[in-house]
């Protein structure tokens, strides 16, 4: 079955800046690629970024600068301040619309014991089956 | 008829600020971005920012950070740009344009404002 | 930031003709580009999205193709009313970005 895998990392350089790496493992098609934060996209959760493989990217603030990195793999850096920036225990959620295995997303935080300039290592997630 | 109808003229004084307006009839609001372009006087077209109406959030060429900023009021279908601390180089036709989500591209453009900053 | 080349500034054609407007990408920016067409005085309206789709309403003498980084504009069977400057966009990546644009004379 397939997977989506959610790493979460602090920048070392700036304390409200993160960086947000999503990937789908499976053998299908990705049709699109939504990230949000505060929970699940549609369930409570903020839209940071969409992604179309062919398309192209929308991104929202604080969203800084979304990207895919692979075929299968996207990142995305976030830079806040205020009201708009994440915090250390922020649950950001990546959903992968692929063909044709329908919709997957998972959800990832900081690790608690991370210090700045440290991450999660990019081990799937749990799985939610949204289709 | 899908319209946007943005606000008249504005003869502005360097320093000041100005806030023009994109008011969008015909369609569901909530369903579209707005996004926002400038066009200084015989140039090319320069992407400010979008803003989504339904919950304000906004993104910004980081060109235009401090310089521009994007708000909408949903009751009167309105979406504004407030722009800041204006220059000569600030003067030039301001579009709003409505982004399609599900095809990703501008489909509509307003009727444009035109900027012009001179003491 | 992803640049977007268009070379030609201006072109001259005539009645009838067939022309093809480039516009360059920096990078690969996949199907990401729409053609837009701005009559003088007028807003931009859009002519092409996602490379070589026709917007609604659109002739079917505007033709749009390319992916990567080169994408082209072809309008066969000129006519007069297509006077008028000719931009490409980029919205594969923020900002998104515009080409300098191409002047269309017709004769």
């Known amino acids: 079955t397939p997977e989506v895998w959610v790493q979460v990392r602090m920048e070392a350089t700036e304390l409200s800046s993160f960086t947000i790496r999503c990937g789908f493992l499976g053998s299908g098609s990705i049709s699109l690629v939504t990230v949000s934060w505060g929970g699940p996209n549609g369930a409570g959760g903020t839209t940071l970024a969409v992604l179309h493989p062919e398309r192209g990217i929308r991104q929202w603030a604080p969203a800084r600068q979304a990207r895919w990195e692979t075929q299968s793999s996207i990142s995305l850096i976030l830079e806040g301040s205020g009201a708009s920036s994440p915090c250390a225990n922020t649950t950001f959620c990546c959903k992968f619309a692929s063909f044709p295995e329908g919709s997957w997303e998972a959800c990832g935080s900081l690790p608690p014991s991370s210090d700045p300039g440290l991450s999660a290592p990019p081990t799937p997630a749990p799985i939610l089956r949204a289709d | 008829e899908v319209q946007l109808q943005q606000s008249g003229p504005e003869l502005v004084k360097p320093g000041s600020s100005v806030k023009i307006s994109c008011e969008a009839s015909?369609?569901?609001?909530?369903?579209?971005?707005v996004d926002w372009v400038k066009q200084s006087h015989g140039k090319s077209l320069e992407w400010i920012g979008a803003?989504?109406?339904?919950?304000?959030?906004?993104s910004y060429n980081q060109k235009f950070e401090g310089k521009a900023t994007l708000t909408v009021d949903k009751s009167s279908t309105t979406a504004y740009m407030e722009l800041r601390s204006l220059t000569s180089e600030d003067s030039a036709v301001y579009y709003c344009?409505?982004?399609?989500?599900?095809?990703?591209?501008?489909?509509?453009w307003g009727t444009g404002t035109t900027v012009t900053v001179s003491s | 930031d992803i640049v977007m080349t268009q070379s030609q500034k201006f072109m001259s054609t005539s009645v009838g003709d067939r022309v093809s407007i480039t516009c360059k990408a920096s990078?690969?920016?996949?199907?990401?580009v729409d053609w837009y067409q701005q009559k003088p005085g007028q807003s931009p309206k859009t002519l092409i999205h996602?490379?070589?789709n026709r917007h609604t309403g659109v002739p079917d003498r505007f033709t749009g193709s390319g992916s990567g980084t080169d994408f082209t504009l072809t309008i066969s069977n000129i006519q007069s009313e297509d006077l008028a400057d000719y931009f490409c966009?980029?919205?594969?990546?923020?900002?998104?970005?515009f080409g300098g644009g191409t002047k269309l004379e017709v004769k």
């Open positions: 344009a409505r982004w399609v989500n599900n095809d990703w591209y501008f489909d509509v």
């Open positions: 015909g369609f569901t609001f909530a369903d579209y971005n």
């Open positions: 803003i989504n109406p339904n919950d304000g959030g906004t």
């Open positions: 990078q690969n920016v996949r199907s990401a």
């Open positions: 996602s490379a070589s």
């Open positions: 966009l980029q919205h594969w990546n923020y900002p998104y970005t």
